[in-house]
Amino acid sequence: LSTGVSFFFLSFHISNLQFNSSLEDPSTDYYQELQRDISEMFLQIYKQGGFLGLSNIKFRPG
Amino acid sequence: SVVVQLTLAFREGTINVHDVETQFNQYKTEAASRYNLTISDVSVSDVPFPFSAQSGAG
Protein backbone atom coordinates (compact mmCIF):
# COMPACT_ATOMS: atom_id res chain seq x y z
CA LEU A 1 0.00 0.00 0.00
CA SER A 2 1.54 3.29 -1.13
CA THR A 3 0.27 6.58 0.28
CA GLY A 4 2.50 8.83 -1.83
CA VAL A 5 3.90 10.28 1.41
CA SER A 6 6.92 9.28 3.48
CA PHE A 7 6.96 10.06 7.19
CA PHE A 8 10.04 10.47 9.38
CA PHE A 9 10.23 10.65 13.14
CA LEU A 10 12.85 13.16 14.24
CA SER A 11 14.11 13.94 17.71
CA PHE A 12 16.80 16.31 18.93
CA HIS A 13 17.97 18.19 22.01
CA ILE A 14 18.07 21.96 22.38
CA SER A 15 20.81 22.27 24.94
CA ASN A 16 20.63 26.02 25.55
CA LEU A 17 16.94 26.00 26.56
CA GLN A 18 15.49 24.94 29.88
CA PHE A 19 12.37 22.80 30.00
CA ASN A 20 9.57 24.12 32.14
CA SER A 21 5.88 23.42 32.55
CA SER A 22 4.86 26.03 29.96
CA LEU A 23 6.21 23.67 27.26
CA GLU A 24 3.46 21.25 28.27
CA ASP A 25 0.79 23.84 27.52
CA PRO A 26 0.29 24.78 23.84
CA SER A 27 -1.46 28.01 24.83
CA THR A 28 1.66 29.58 26.42
CA ASP A 29 3.86 32.11 24.65
CA TYR A 30 6.98 30.02 25.29
CA TYR A 31 5.41 26.96 23.64
CA GLN A 32 4.08 28.92 20.67
CA GLU A 33 7.31 30.83 20.05
CA LEU A 34 9.41 27.68 20.13
CA GLN A 35 6.97 25.84 17.90
CA ARG A 36 6.99 28.74 15.42
CA ASP A 37 10.80 28.91 15.34
CA ILE A 38 11.10 25.16 14.83
CA SER A 39 8.47 25.11 12.07
CA GLU A 40 10.18 28.01 10.30
CA MET A 41 13.56 26.31 10.69
CA PHE A 42 12.35 23.11 9.03
CA LEU A 43 10.90 25.06 6.12
CA GLN A 44 14.37 26.57 5.67
CA ILE A 45 16.21 23.26 5.93
CA TYR A 46 14.01 21.30 3.52
CA LYS A 47 13.15 24.09 1.11
CA GLN A 48 13.82 21.91 -1.92
CA GLY A 49 10.67 20.35 -3.35
CA GLY A 50 9.18 17.32 -1.65
CA PHE A 51 8.80 18.63 1.90
CA LEU A 52 5.13 18.63 2.86
CA GLY A 53 5.31 19.80 6.43
CA LEU A 54 5.69 18.74 10.04
CA SER A 55 3.30 17.67 12.74
CA ASN A 56 3.02 16.21 16.23
CA ILE A 57 5.59 18.50 17.82
CA LYS A 58 6.22 17.45 21.40
CA PHE A 59 8.54 18.97 24.00
CA ARG A 60 10.04 16.91 26.78
CA PRO A 61 12.59 17.52 29.51
CA GLY A 62 16.14 16.62 28.44
CA SER B 1 17.68 21.00 27.96
CA VAL B 2 14.55 20.49 25.86
CA VAL B 3 13.94 17.36 23.80
CA VAL B 4 11.93 18.03 20.65
CA GLN B 5 10.08 15.20 18.91
CA LEU B 6 8.15 15.63 15.69
CA THR B 7 7.03 14.00 12.46
CA LEU B 8 8.18 15.20 9.03
CA ALA B 9 6.28 14.46 5.83
CA PHE B 10 7.77 14.34 2.33
CA ARG B 11 6.50 13.32 -1.05
CA GLU B 12 7.36 9.66 -1.44
CA GLY B 13 10.63 9.00 -3.21
CA THR B 14 11.99 12.54 -2.88
CA ILE B 15 14.31 11.99 0.09
CA ASN B 16 15.91 9.09 1.93
CA VAL B 17 16.40 8.78 5.67
CA HIS B 18 20.11 9.59 5.39
CA ASP B 19 19.47 12.94 3.70
CA VAL B 20 16.76 13.90 6.19
CA GLU B 21 19.35 13.56 8.94
CA THR B 22 22.29 15.02 6.98
CA GLN B 23 20.42 18.13 5.85
CA PHE B 24 19.24 18.77 9.39
CA ASN B 25 22.73 18.27 10.84
CA GLN B 26 24.25 20.62 8.28
CA TYR B 27 21.82 23.35 9.35
CA LYS B 28 22.74 23.24 13.05
CA THR B 29 25.20 26.13 12.89
CA GLU B 30 22.69 28.35 11.15
CA ALA B 31 20.00 27.33 13.65
CA ALA B 32 22.23 28.56 16.45
CA SER B 33 22.81 31.96 14.86
CA ARG B 34 19.37 32.54 13.35
CA TYR B 35 17.13 31.07 16.04
CA ASN B 36 19.50 30.87 19.01
CA LEU B 37 18.89 27.12 19.22
CA THR B 38 21.84 24.89 20.10
CA ILE B 39 20.94 21.52 18.60
CA SER B 40 22.48 18.15 19.46
CA ASP B 41 21.68 14.42 19.62
CA VAL B 42 19.78 14.30 16.34
CA SER B 43 17.98 11.04 15.63
CA VAL B 44 15.89 10.21 12.55
CA SER B 45 13.91 7.10 11.73
CA ASP B 46 11.21 6.22 9.27
CA VAL B 47 7.67 5.94 10.58
CA PRO B 48 6.15 2.55 9.69
CA PHE B 49 2.95 2.88 7.71
CA PRO B 50 0.16 2.96 8.73
CA PHE B 51 0.53 5.14 11.78
CA SER B 52 -1.70 7.43 13.82
CA ALA B 53 -4.32 9.05 11.61
CA GLN B 54 -3.93 12.32 13.51
CA SER B 55 -0.40 12.68 12.10
CA GLY B 56 -1.36 14.61 9.01
CA ALA B 57 1.27 17.00 7.68
CA GLY B 58 0.92 20.73 8.14
Epitope: G50 | E12, G13, N16, V17, H18, Q26
Partner: antibody, heavy 120, light 107 residues
Framework: QVQLVQSGAEVKKPGASVKVSCKAS????????MHWIKQAPGQGLEWIGY????????HYNQKFKDKATLTRDKSASTAYMELYSLRSEDTAVYYC?????????????WGQGTLVTVSS | DIQMTQSPSSLSASVGDRVTITCRAS??????LVWYQQKPGKSPKLLVY???TLTDGVPSRFSGSGSGTQYSLTISSLQPEDVATYYC?????????FGSGTKLEIK
Amino acid sequence: QVQLVQSGAEVKKPGASVKVSCKASGYTFTTYTMHWIKQAPGQGLEWIGYINPGSDYTHYNQKFKDKATLTRDKSASTAYMELYSLRSEDTAVYYCARQGNYAAYYFDYWGQGTLVTVSS
Amino acid sequence: DIQMTQSPSSLSASVGDRVTITCRASGNIHNFLVWYQQKPGKSPKLLVYNAKTLTDGVPSRFSGSGSGTQYSLTISSLQPEDVATYYCQNFWNVPFTFGSGTKLEIK
Protein backbone atom coordinates in the same frame (compact mmCIF):
# COMPACT_ATOMS: atom_id res chain seq x y z
CA GLN C 1 28.80 15.14 -22.27
CA VAL C 2 29.37 14.03 -18.69
CA GLN C 3 32.69 12.29 -18.12
CA LEU C 4 34.53 11.05 -15.04
CA VAL C 5 38.16 10.30 -15.86
CA GLN C 6 40.22 8.56 -13.21
CA SER C 7 43.98 8.43 -12.72
CA GLY C 8 45.99 5.45 -13.89
CA ALA C 9 46.81 2.15 -12.23
CA GLU C 10 49.09 2.17 -9.19
CA VAL C 11 51.35 -0.44 -7.63
CA LYS C 12 52.19 0.20 -3.99
CA LYS C 13 54.05 -1.55 -1.20
CA PRO C 14 52.28 -2.55 2.03
CA GLY C 15 52.11 0.35 4.47
CA ALA C 16 52.25 3.00 1.73
CA SER C 17 49.51 5.45 0.73
CA VAL C 18 47.94 6.19 -2.63
CA LYS C 19 45.86 9.08 -3.95
CA VAL C 20 43.39 8.38 -6.75
CA SER C 21 41.86 11.24 -8.72
CA CYS C 22 38.57 11.60 -10.56
CA LYS C 23 38.34 14.51 -13.02
CA ALA C 24 34.77 15.57 -13.81
CA SER C 25 33.68 17.36 -16.96
CA GLY C 26 30.48 18.14 -18.84
CA TYR C 27 28.50 19.32 -15.80
CA THR C 28 28.70 21.64 -12.78
CA PHE C 29 31.03 19.76 -10.46
CA THR C 30 29.81 21.38 -7.23
CA THR C 31 26.14 20.41 -7.60
CA TYR C 32 26.50 16.63 -7.69
CA THR C 33 27.69 14.36 -4.89
CA MET C 34 30.66 12.12 -5.73
CA HIS C 35 30.83 8.60 -4.32
CA TRP C 36 33.65 6.06 -4.24
CA ILE C 37 33.24 2.32 -4.62
CA LYS C 38 35.68 -0.57 -4.16
CA GLN C 39 35.70 -3.76 -6.20
CA ALA C 40 38.25 -6.37 -5.14
CA PRO C 41 39.37 -8.85 -7.85
CA GLY C 42 36.50 -11.15 -8.78
CA GLN C 43 34.35 -9.66 -6.01
CA GLY C 44 31.32 -7.44 -5.69
CA LEU C 45 30.90 -3.72 -5.10
CA GLU C 46 31.51 -2.04 -1.76
CA TRP C 47 30.50 1.56 -0.99
CA ILE C 48 33.31 3.60 0.60
CA GLY C 49 31.72 7.02 1.07
CA TYR C 50 30.94 10.30 -0.62
CA ILE C 51 31.88 13.95 -0.78
CA ASN C 52 29.61 16.86 -1.58
CA PRO C 53 31.95 19.04 -3.66
CA GLY C 54 29.93 22.18 -3.01
CA SER C 55 29.95 22.04 0.79
CA ASP C 56 32.95 19.70 1.26
CA TYR C 57 30.71 17.52 3.46
CA THR C 58 31.88 13.91 3.58
CA HIS C 59 30.31 10.72 4.85
CA TYR C 60 32.11 7.41 5.14
CA ASN C 61 31.18 3.79 5.44
CA GLN C 62 32.38 3.03 9.00
CA LYS C 63 34.44 0.19 7.57
CA PHE C 64 36.56 2.68 5.58
CA LYS C 65 36.71 5.68 7.93
CA ASP C 66 40.30 4.91 8.97
CA LYS C 67 41.32 3.73 5.52
CA ALA C 68 40.17 6.47 3.13
CA THR C 69 39.99 10.26 3.02
CA LEU C 70 37.88 12.02 0.41
CA THR C 71 38.75 15.52 -0.77
CA ARG C 72 38.09 17.73 -3.75
CA ASP C 73 39.57 20.63 -5.69
CA LYS C 74 36.69 22.77 -6.94
CA SER C 75 38.87 24.80 -9.30
CA ALA C 76 40.08 21.63 -10.99
CA SER C 77 36.67 19.89 -10.90
CA THR C 78 38.45 16.90 -9.41
CA ALA C 79 37.61 14.56 -6.54
CA TYR C 80 40.30 12.59 -4.74
CA MET C 81 40.44 9.52 -2.57
CA GLU C 82 43.54 8.81 -0.52
CA LEU C 83 44.04 5.33 0.91
CA TYR C 84 46.37 4.82 3.85
CA SER C 85 48.34 1.96 5.43
CA LEU C 86 47.84 -0.19 2.38
CA ARG C 87 47.54 -3.95 2.79
CA SER C 88 47.08 -6.76 0.30
CA GLU C 89 43.31 -6.74 0.90
CA ASP C 90 43.19 -3.16 -0.41
CA THR C 91 44.10 -4.46 -3.87
CA ALA C 92 41.07 -3.56 -5.94
CA VAL C 93 39.59 -1.43 -8.67
CA TYR C 94 38.30 1.83 -7.18
CA TYR C 95 35.53 3.72 -8.93
CA CYS C 96 34.24 7.24 -8.54
CA ALA C 97 30.56 7.62 -9.36
CA ARG C 98 28.31 10.65 -9.57
CA GLN C 99 25.01 10.67 -7.74
CA GLY C 100 22.19 12.16 -9.76
CA ASN C 101 20.94 15.60 -8.74
CA TYR C 102 18.08 16.45 -6.35
CA ALA C 103 15.95 13.42 -5.38
CA ALA C 104 18.08 11.24 -7.67
CA TYR C 105 19.15 8.28 -5.60
CA TYR C 106 21.41 6.39 -7.99
CA PHE C 107 24.84 6.60 -9.62
CA ASP C 108 24.26 7.80 -13.16
CA TYR C 109 27.89 8.14 -14.30
CA TRP C 110 30.93 6.11 -13.28
CA GLY C 111 34.64 6.60 -13.82
CA GLN C 112 36.54 3.93 -15.72
CA GLY C 113 38.08 2.63 -12.50
CA THR C 114 41.60 2.74 -11.07
CA LEU C 115 43.38 -0.50 -10.24
CA VAL C 116 45.42 -0.25 -7.06
CA THR C 117 47.71 -3.22 -6.50
CA VAL C 118 49.36 -3.69 -3.13
CA SER C 119 52.34 -6.02 -3.34
CA SER C 120 55.70 -6.37 -1.64
CA ASP D 1 23.43 -1.61 8.45
CA ILE D 2 21.02 -2.85 5.81
CA GLN D 3 22.15 -6.14 4.28
CA MET D 4 21.23 -6.88 0.67
CA THR D 5 20.79 -10.56 -0.17
CA GLN D 6 20.81 -11.21 -3.89
CA SER D 7 19.85 -14.48 -5.55
CA PRO D 8 20.77 -16.50 -7.41
CA SER D 9 24.52 -15.87 -7.35
CA SER D 10 24.77 -17.22 -10.89
CA LEU D 11 22.30 -18.09 -13.59
CA SER D 12 22.50 -19.77 -16.98
CA ALA D 13 19.61 -19.29 -19.40
CA SER D 14 18.86 -19.50 -23.09
CA VAL D 15 18.34 -16.63 -25.51
CA GLY D 16 14.67 -15.63 -25.38
CA ASP D 17 14.16 -16.90 -21.82
CA ARG D 18 12.49 -14.83 -19.14
CA VAL D 19 14.98 -14.27 -16.32
CA THR D 20 14.33 -12.91 -12.82
CA ILE D 21 16.91 -11.85 -10.24
CA THR D 22 15.79 -11.08 -6.70
CA CYS D 23 17.15 -8.88 -3.96
CA ARG D 24 16.05 -8.94 -0.34
CA ALA D 25 16.86 -6.10 2.06
CA SER D 26 17.22 -6.75 5.78
CA GLY D 27 14.90 -3.78 6.44
CA ASN D 28 12.36 -1.69 4.58
CA ILE D 29 14.22 0.44 2.02
CA HIS D 30 11.10 2.20 0.73
CA ASN D 31 11.79 1.58 -2.98
CA PHE D 32 15.21 3.27 -2.77
CA LEU D 33 16.58 0.31 -4.70
CA VAL D 34 18.87 0.53 -7.72
CA TRP D 35 19.97 -2.10 -10.26
CA TYR D 36 23.28 -1.96 -12.15
CA GLN D 37 24.71 -4.07 -14.95
CA GLN D 38 28.44 -4.70 -15.12
CA LYS D 39 30.08 -6.33 -18.11
CA PRO D 40 33.53 -7.91 -17.73
CA GLY D 41 36.29 -5.30 -17.49
CA LYS D 42 33.82 -2.40 -17.55
CA SER D 43 32.33 0.01 -15.05
CA PRO D 44 28.83 -0.68 -13.76
CA LYS D 45 25.97 0.87 -15.71
CA LEU D 46 22.71 2.16 -14.26
CA LEU D 47 19.65 0.14 -15.30
CA VAL D 48 16.81 0.82 -12.86
CA TYR D 49 16.28 3.24 -9.96
CA ASN D 50 13.49 3.82 -7.45
CA ALA D 51 12.91 0.05 -7.75
CA LYS D 52 11.07 0.29 -11.05
CA THR D 53 12.11 3.31 -13.12
CA LEU D 54 14.09 2.34 -16.20
CA THR D 55 16.92 4.71 -17.02
CA ASP D 56 17.10 6.31 -20.47
CA GLY D 57 18.44 4.05 -23.20
CA VAL D 58 17.87 0.78 -21.35
CA PRO D 59 15.88 -1.72 -23.45
CA SER D 60 12.26 -2.25 -22.40
CA ARG D 61 12.87 -5.98 -21.88
CA PHE D 62 14.33 -4.95 -18.51
CA SER D 63 11.91 -4.17 -15.70
CA GLY D 64 12.12 -3.69 -11.97
CA SER D 65 9.51 -4.37 -9.33
CA GLY D 66 9.01 -4.85 -5.63
CA SER D 67 8.54 -2.85 -2.45
CA GLY D 68 9.46 -2.91 1.21
CA THR D 69 12.19 -5.52 1.55
CA GLN D 70 11.65 -7.61 -1.61
CA TYR D 71 12.71 -6.49 -5.09
CA SER D 72 13.34 -8.09 -8.44
CA LEU D 73 14.84 -7.38 -11.86
CA THR D 74 13.31 -9.18 -14.81
CA ILE D 75 14.58 -9.59 -18.37
CA SER D 76 11.54 -10.59 -20.41
CA SER D 77 13.48 -12.06 -23.33
CA LEU D 78 17.18 -12.70 -22.73
CA GLN D 79 19.58 -11.42 -25.39
CA PRO D 80 23.26 -12.34 -25.88
CA GLU D 81 24.33 -8.79 -24.94
CA ASP D 82 22.71 -9.22 -21.51
CA VAL D 83 25.58 -11.45 -20.36
CA ALA D 84 26.89 -9.54 -17.34
CA THR D 85 26.84 -9.39 -13.56
CA TYR D 86 23.87 -7.58 -12.05
CA TYR D 87 23.94 -5.77 -8.70
CA CYS D 88 21.21 -4.30 -6.55
CA GLN D 89 21.93 -1.40 -4.20
CA ASN D 90 20.23 0.03 -1.14
CA PHE D 91 19.97 3.81 -1.38
CA TRP D 92 17.73 4.29 1.65
CA ASN D 93 20.38 4.65 4.32
CA VAL D 94 24.12 4.59 4.78
CA PRO D 95 26.12 2.55 4.17
CA PHE D 96 24.66 2.31 0.68
CA THR D 97 25.17 -1.43 0.48
CA PHE D 98 25.21 -3.55 -2.67
CA GLY D 99 23.99 -7.08 -3.19
CA SER D 100 26.69 -9.67 -3.85
CA GLY D 101 25.85 -9.84 -7.55
CA THR D 102 24.23 -12.28 -9.99
CA LYS D 103 26.37 -13.54 -12.84
CA LEU D 104 24.18 -14.15 -15.87
CA GLU D 105 25.38 -16.45 -18.65
CA ILE D 106 23.91 -17.81 -21.87
CA LYS D 107 23.38 -21.58 -22.15
